[in-house]
């Protein structure tokens, strides 16, 4: 991820992001980029916008790419069916 | 105060379809999804699915697939539940409850008082 | 599906002493360093209540005798010193994995 800034809610945050939980201090959340092809996501991370405090670390994936299963717990954004 | 307003008991024959109502008040309804959860006679909770009351966007268990619909009305805050093709193993109070906004951790703070939905012929 | 089983399915405890409830689920609901789990309470005639949620958080009002600890798989629900009012089924629910799904319930009394 990219730190962009500090943030508490998706509001903050650019278009293409979210206000995730950053991956190396729990207690702080920054605007992250939506996740693209490839990344790793999981399905219940909140769509965007999202008004209260996310907990995750990974934004959803962007429009057209879906959070889907590739193996036992691990999800990635792919290219919708 | 918050506030969950459900709409009264209902009866069905086997093959009809039942929409429950939920009208919130004393919050922003627009920032909180709604969740629907019913509960068989003696039984414990089923989850149904969820809606997000700002854009529409639906979860359903898939269970409960093609044949549940959750709608929602921004202008008058509520929200609607929608089951076709019932039969007698949906008789249950059909509960909405609001999602608390706990980021990723999805839990219900406050629940309406629940519809009775009985399906007999 | 996540199959969440609860142990046991009733508990009679005298007041002032202390009722756990276990809960289990058929695999794991933590994800990313948190466990995604909830415990409600219901009493007769009434919707759940919110308890606990993300597995060790207190809800806003609930009062400090309630506490839940636990991860991966196993989660507990502890009342540490049962009052009258806390007479009620208690139900834990999973959120790491759709659909969200409920423990079957452990029917707390006074012994």
């Known amino acids: 991820a990219v730190i962009t800034g500090a943030c508490d809610k998706d509001s903050q945050c650019g278009g293409g992001m979210c206000c995730a939980v950053s991956i190396w201090v729990k207690s702080i959340r920054i605007c992250t980029p939506m996740g693209k092809l490839g990344d790793s996501c999981h399905p219940l991370t909140r769509k965007v916008p999202f008004f209260g405090r996310r907990m995750h670390h990974t934004c959803p994936c962007l429009p057209g790419l879906a959070c889907l299963r590739t193996s036992f717990n691990r999800f990635i954004c792919l290219a919708q069916k | 105060e918050v506030q969950l307003v459900q709409s009264g008991a209902e009866v069905k024959k086997p093959g009809a379809s039942v929409k429950v109502s939920c009208k919130a008040s004393g919050y922003s309804f627009t920032d909180y999804d709604m969740h629907w959860v019913r509960q068989a006679p003696g039984q414990g909770l089923e989850w149904i699915g969820y809606?997000?009351?700002?854009?529409?966007?639906?979860t359903y268990n898939q269970k409960f697939k093609g044949r549940v619909t959750i709608t929602v009305d921004k202008s008058t805050s509520t929200a609607y539940l929608e089951l076709s093709s019932l039969r007698s193993e949906d008789t249950a109070v059909y509960y909405c409850?609001?999602?608390?906004?706990?980021?990723?951790?999805?839990?219900?703070?406050?629940w309406g008082q629940g519809t009775l939905v009985t399906v007999s012929s | 599906d996540i199959v969440m089983t609860q142990s046991p399915d009733s508990l009679a405890v005298s007041l002032g002493e202390r009722a756990t409830i276990n809960c289990k689920a058929s695999?794991?609901?933590?994800?990313?360093?948190?466990?995604?789990m909830n415990w409600y309470q219901q009493k007769p005639g009434q919707p759940p209540k919110l308890l606990i949620y993300?597995?060790?958080n207190l809800e806003s009002g609930v009062p400090d005798r309630f506490s839940g600890s636990g991860s991966g798989t196993d989660f507990t629900l502890t009342i540490s010193s049962l009052q009258a009012e806390d007479v009620a089924v208690y139900y834990c629910?999973?959120?790491?994995?759709?659909?969200?799904?409920f423990g079957q319930g452990t029917k707390v009394e006074i012994k």
């Open positions: 809606i997000s009351c700002y854009n529409g966007a639906t």
């Open positions: 409850a609001r999602d608390a906004n706990y980021g990723e951790a999805y839990a219900m703070d406050y």
């Open positions: 695999q794991s609901v933590d994800y990313d360093g948190d466990s995604y």
């Open positions: 993300a597995a060790s």
């Open positions: 629910q999973q959120i790491n994995e759709d659909p969200f799904t």
